[in-house]
């Protein structure tokens, strides 16, 4: 028995920040779980972890240097990534493990979300074209 995960196929991070919502076919209320976001086709980089416990405050952390926050819904976890770099454009996968109460459950691998990071390009504005050559 596996949890199904739905993610947007693609998101664009215009201001080097993005909200990625992971929607699960499972109610996380009163469960102890570990939701995580992984970068790359091989999911090699664990970008962010949201640890939920029935008795404690939500714990959100990254051990890989990402600036992340997390928000919990009944059947979703939303990861808020900030300060993304253009070279972090990649495919990102949501993962969920429900530990308590048993039985342990995890998810079928999702299709992932391509996050396209558009950097802040310092282009001259048409109204303020900048200094012109004499």
């Amino acid at each position: 028995n596996k949890i199904l995960v739905k993610q947007s196929p693609m998101l664009v991070a215009y201001d080097n920040a993005v909200n990625l919502s992971c929607k699960y076919s499972y109610n996380l209320f009163s469960r102890e779980f570990r939701a995580s976001l992984h970068k790359g086709l091989d999911s090699a980089v664990e970008v962010c972890v949201v640890y939920g416990n029935y008795s404690q405050q939500l714990q959100v952390y990254s051990k890989t240097g990402f600036n992340c926050d997390g928000k919990l819904g009944n059947e979703s976890v939303t990861f808020y990534l900030q300060n993304l770099y253009v070279n972090q454009t990649d495919i990102y996968f949501c993962k969920i493990e429900v530990m308590y109460p048993p039985p342990y459950l995890d998810n079928e691998k999702s299709n992932g979300t391509i996050i396209h990071v558009k950097g802040k390009h310092l282009c001259p504005s048409p109204l303020f074209p900048g200094p012109s050559k004499p």
Epitope: E32, R34, Y54, E97, M99, Y100, P102, Y104, D106
Partner: antibody
């Protein structure tokens, strides 16, 4: 046949660290459906759960020990490890590794245990 | 944390006696009709051995004289006819919540 064999116990100085090993055979530590925990038992006392590792590599710890303990594994050796830091006399115990299945989390197979004595 | 309290802490019994040990949890360990409460036997110098899982299911290879019952917060381990090899310490354990906790143990001694 499922087997768990602990090693690495012995005499350790207070303030020191220990690293115990648990070699598993008869099943794979990375196969979905089973996890392994470390459990300890002080001389003449009851059983205390230290923490668990799931097939995915996710770890869970007893909050009373969390700041001092790390559970890890080497899939190529099918071996589990327990690192415990800042040891004190009350950490003197027999340390067991035990397997559990994902249905009920009951510990169905146990190692023979390894004794750790913390003393100067 | 879920506290498990076993009673009695120790008991003396004779071969052939019916023995009952109780385990009370500080909160329910039931979830969707399953009780996440297990019983172990431990002999001196040996590792614990699983006897009963999920309150009443007999672990493979365990003699049928061992049985478990109960739900919610109150559980019982029964040995219908005590055998010489049954003199040991018995522990209950819950796996409903983390941290997983054990009862303090019940020592069954020869009368």
């Amino acid at each position: 046949e499922v087997q768990l064999v602990e090693s690495g116990g012995g005499l350790v100085q207070p303030g020191g660290s220990l690293r115990l090993s648990c070699a598993a055979s008869g099943f794979s530590l990375s196969t979905s459906g089973v996890g392994v925990s470390w459990i300890r038992q002080a001389p003449g006392k009851g059983l205390e759960w230290i923490g668990s590792i799931y097939h995915s590599g996710s770890t869970y710890y007893n909050p009373s020990l969390k700041s001092r303990v790390t559970i890890s594994r080497d899939n190529s050796k099918n071996t589990l490890y327990l690192q415990l830091n800042s040891l004190r006399a009350e950490d003197t115990a027999v340390y067991y590794c035990a397997r559990y299945e994902y249905d009920y989390y009951a510990f169905d197979y146990w190692g023979q245990g390894t004794l750790v004595t913390v003393s100067s | 944390d879920i506290q498990l309290t076993q009673s009695p802490s120790s008991l003396s019994a004779s071969v052939g006696d019916r023995v009952t040990i109780t385990c009370r949890a500080s909160q329910s360990v039931d979830f969707y009709g399953i009780s996440f409460l297990h019983w172990y036997q431990q002999k001196p110098g040996k590792a614990p051995k699983l006897l009963i899982y999920a309150a009443s299911s007999l672990q493979s290879g365990v003699p049928s004289r061992f049985s478990g019952s109960g739900s919610g917060t109150d559980f019982t381990l029964t040995i219908s006819s005590l055998q010489p090899e049954d003199f040991a310490t018995y522990y209950c354990q819950q796996s409903y919540r983390t941290p997983r906790t054990f009862g303090q143990g019940t020592k069954v001694e020869i009368k």
